[in-house]
Interface confidence: medium
Amino acid sequence: DAHKSEVAHRFKDLGEENFKALVLIAFAQYLQQCPFEDHVKLVNEVTEFAKTCVADESAENCDKSLHTLFGDKLCTVATLRETYGEMADCCAKQEPERNECFLQHKDDNPNLPRLVRPEVDVMCTAFHDNEETFLKKYLYEIARRHPYFYAPELLFFAKRYKAAFTECCQAADKAACLLPKLDELRDEGKASSAKQRLKCASLQKFGERAFKAWAVARLSQRFPKAEFAEVSKLVTDLTKVHTECCHGDLLECADDRADLAKYICENQDSISSKLKECCEKPLLEKSHCIAEVENDEMPADLPSLAADFVESKDVCKNYAEAKDVFLGMFLYEYARRHPDYSVVLLLRLAKTYETTLEKCCAAADPHECYAKVFDEFKPLVEEPQNLIKQNCELFEQLGEYKFQNALLVRYTKKVPQVSTPTLVEVSRNLGKVGSKCCKHPEAKRMPCAEDYLSVVLNQLCVLHEKTPVSDRVTKCCTESLVNRRPCFSALEVDETYVPKEFNAETFTFHADICTLSEKERQIKKQTALVELVKHKPKATKEQLKAVMDDFAAFVEKCCKADDKETCFAEEGKKLVAASQAALGL
């Protein structure tokens, strides 16, 4: 549906508040280093322009594309070259190359200071003094640190952020009310960002077909009563929404997401019985709720898959007629019967089925050739089942912190070239799979664990892509999206790695560790553990455990000492010497 003025169309559809918020997110995700005030100025200029177009769609420049309008605005930033270096070269390009250029310069790990949470009273005063600026600042700070954050979902987070301050700044104990809510928003926000980053990586690195396959599998698990044509329509629409958001087209994305939520709610009878509550909520909550809705019950009398996909004499004819539709149907039928499988496992099964048909439909006796295809699925299903069983047993035995440490050692030995902060961040997140998924019954463990691991390993992949240091990481990240986890699981100790030179400074600690939160203290210790493994990759679990136990005792002892700094200096030297001896350094 062509509109004379795209900017006027989106302004009218979204309303001024959402329009301004989404433009701010878009700008902050592109120019991640720009000061808040500069972005607000740019957004206000774009908003004023949009209003002139709403008043008269034929006004000058109103017919320009959003990329042209936004790109032109971003290219007016005076300090572009000083702040962003070669990104300034994007401005010499024409659309659509200019937007592609901006997208390529998005930084998953921008050099920005850590967000420090002020005192509650300070935050409440700032909230009351200027609520609008306070909330814009939240959008800006999240968007610039998470350049692929799902923009319409960030609006939902901002709404919850506002609600938390509105409620808690009036409470008797502001901190007790507010801090848990902010912690929850922070943790959910990080998870949401990582999940969306995988969607964008899937689209950008592996293409629309890969994303659609993922969506068919996930939506078929979630809506097993919906028929294939319904699932196909939802997949097509969802792909458009995520393609737009991942491509920086945030206004179109938010608008289309709202349309999709509307369609789902208008057609919920033919989609899922679980949507009723979601569909009674306001727009942002509704969209979030639909995205998180539990799987509907499976229809009772689903026939055997073998009849249609193995035993039928029409298999090769059906496949030849419309390969992707037939494979889509296979994936739909398999996924709706298996909410107990991870999406990536379902995609591996579909890939195996496709490979078999490609081979067998060219054979002399196709049916004889593909008759046993389902037997090939057994080892593919058992591999993640066994892995999850083993790791959940280890998690239950060790607890989260020590389980993370076991993964830190495991992954540092696999890919020791990766930077220590990345190894710590990724391994800590991998370790969270235990508390997140092992509590679930068998039927929910695999979809929880393996699909979560896909999200975490994608973090490793995007961080590594920025500064590649390991061919093994590159190989696992780029060869196959659905086999990333099995690829990393299969990696053994890197025998080619030359151990890092010992540096006493790395293992020197100071009294400031005593004032850190438990989480920060863990990160310090885990950083030391990674460095130890990099120095001594052949160290045994027992050796590493002994050193880490000594280290924990050392920190505890010195933090109780009267003269903490002296204790850290003197006992630290002894610890380093003892550790070197224990590890044979």
Epitope: E227, F228, A229, S232, K233, P303, D308, S312, K313, D314, K317, N318, A320, E321, A322, V325, F326, M329
Partner: nanobody, 125 residues
Framework: QLQVVESGGGLVQAGGSLRLSCTTS????????MGWFRQAPGKEREFVAA?????????DYANSVKGRFTISRDNAKNTVYLQMNSLKPEDTAVYVC?????????????????WGQGTQVTVSS
């Protein structure tokens, strides 16, 4: 939703022929098995013929029409046809086209989700 519209019905003499068409819109036609059913006044709806999804290579017919009726599909035109030859007075009924994404091929009416309004076929003796 999938819309289903039949055409081609009419009055024909016994022994004559008719070709019914059924066109769909609104969804990916290729993913549906298509079927023809008929209902004569005062009788139950009965299965006539069905054709499988995708290539449409598999067909199924009621015993009463085997050898006289042929079902086919043209995916490019989103259309399924029922060629009816050697018509008999007992073939007189409203012929209804239906679409199913429940199975690749089905003769059971409860497995069809989308139905047309029907087209009247009258065979005079």
């Amino acid at each position: 939703q999938l819309q289903v519209v039949e055409s081609g019905g009419g009055l024909v003499q016994a022994g004559g022929s008719l070709r019914l068409s059924c066109t769909t819109s609104g969804r990916a036609f290729i993913g549906y098995a298509m079927g023809w059913f008929r209902q004569a006044p005062g009788k139950e709806r009965e299965f006539v013929a069905a054709i499988s999804w995708f290539a449409g290579d598999t067909t199924d017919y009621a015993n009463s029409v085997k050898g006289r009726f042929t079902i086919s599909r043209d995916n490019a035109k989103n259309t399924v046809y029922l060629q009816m030859n050697s018509l008999k007075p007992e073939d007189t009924a409203v012929y209804v086209c239906a679409a199913s994404s429940a199975r690749p091929l089905s003769s059971r009416s409860d497995e069809y989700h989308y139905w047309g309004q029907g087209t009247q076929v009258t065979v005079s003796s």
